[in-house]
């Protein structure tokens, strides 16, 4: 049986600042159980940058719908890109905990690069 | 089309075991996680244990005494319980899984169900 | 454990009347809420998932609607084989998966 695989196709995404950056990711399968969460950077100081389950992320959108059956595309849009928004992103996907969930398996990362807007 | 079959209940004794087994046809069955919710006589539906791949989930009723596990080269899905207690006397029906993009699981396939009565 | 609550407990319908259900959980579930119908000797069917969206092939009398706390499960116009028991569960926080402790539809 193939163990899931996260998928992240692009090493690197330029964008414009001012312009919405997407990000891709997708699983190969819809097991094991658990969440899948999008954080810029690595290790103990990576920052959240969405989950669907708890918090609020005004500036990310879901290129997949919501509500759609056995999903495996977990592409997100960020909007309004600045510089600060620069970095690597990672998509990583848990497995389901009681009571926490736990990191089972990350993408190699999206190196996103803001450029200057143009005038 | 989606079946699943459920089997192996039956009249067993307080302290007692049985195993149930699910056939699963009509999907891929190895890529969706599987299910057991069980229903006592004249009641509502319990939750009993869930397995993805190698993760299993347990309600805390069943915990330590019941084992899901799951074959996907036989498309079967098994519940072993053991230390059996009239509590547990109910229809156990199997599931397959299905979730919304980034949720949860709900259950959009169920079997037929198999009694299991524990009494002496 | 997120508890659902259902109400009524028993709900006497005239076939062709509108019948609603209610389901109340304890914390907020955003829209992580199923509907199932059961009849007598039956397994339970999916009607609704993400509290709004009707499985494929269940009639569009049924549609669900609510978020966060509380869901209604709505029968516009209620047919001889919609007398049955109907449960809510919720997939929002688990384990452990819970369901609501049903509502019966009787013919009035």
């Known amino acids: 049986e193939d163990e899931l695989q996260v998928i992240q196709p692009e090493k690197s995404v330029s964008v414009a600042a001012g312009e919405s950056a997407t990000l891709r990711c997708a699983m190969t399968s819809l097991i094991p159980v658990g969440p899948i969460m999008w954080f810029r950077g690595a290790g103990a100081g990576r920052e959240l940058i969405y989950n669907q389950k708890e918090g609020h992320f005004p500036r990310v959108t879901t290129v997949s719908e919501l509500t759609k059956r056995n999903n495996l595309d977990f592409s997100i849009s960020i909007s309004n890109i600045t510089p600060a928004d620069a970095g690597t992103y990672y998509c990583v996907k848990f497995r389901k905990g009681s009571p926490d969930d736990v990191e089972f398996k990350s993408g190699a990362g999206t190196e996103l690069s803001v450029r200057a807007k143009p005038s | 089309e989606v079946q699943l079959l459920e089997s192996g209940g039956g009249v067993v004794q307080p302290g007692g075991s049985l195993r149930l087994s699910c056939a699963a046809s009509?999907?891929?069955?190895?890529?969706?996680?599987m299910t057991w919710v069980r229903q006592a006589p004249g009641k509502g539906l319990e939750w009993v244990s869930t397995i993805g791949s190698g993760d299993t989930y347990y309600a805390d009723s069943v915990k330590g005494r019941f084992t899901i596990s799951r074959d996907n080269s036989k498309n079967t899905l098994y519940l072993q319980m053991n230390s059996l207690r009239a509590e547990d006397t109910a229809v156990y029906y199997c599931?397959?899984?299905?979730?919304?993009?980034?949720?949860?699981?709900?259950?959009?396939?169920w079997g037929q169900g198999t009694l299991v009565t524990v009494s002496s | 454990e997120i508890v659902l609550t259902q109400s009524p407990a028993t709900l006497s319908v005239s076939p062709g009347e509108r019948a609603t259900l209610s389901c109340r959980a304890s914390?907020?579930?955003?829209?992580?809420l199923a509907w199932y119908q059961q009849k007598p000797g039956q397994a339970p069917r999916l009607l609704i998932y993400?509290?709004?969206i009707r499985e494929t092939g269940i009639p569009a009398r049924f549609s669900g609607s609510g978020s966060g706390t509380e869901f209604t499960l709505t029968i516009s116009s209620l047919q001889s084989e919609d007398f049955a028991v109907y449960y809510c569960?919720?997939?929002?926080?688990?384990?452990?998966?819970?369901f609501g402790g049903g509502t019966k539809v009787e013919i009035k």
């Open positions: 569960q919720q997939y929002y926080d688990w384990p452990p998966f819970t």
């Open positions: 993400a509290a709004r």
């Open positions: 914390q907020n579930v955003k829209n992580d």
């Open positions: 009509g999907f891929s069955f190895s890529n969706f996680a």
């Open positions: 599931a397959k899984d299905s979730t919304v993009s980034w949720s949860g699981d709900f259950f959009d396939y």
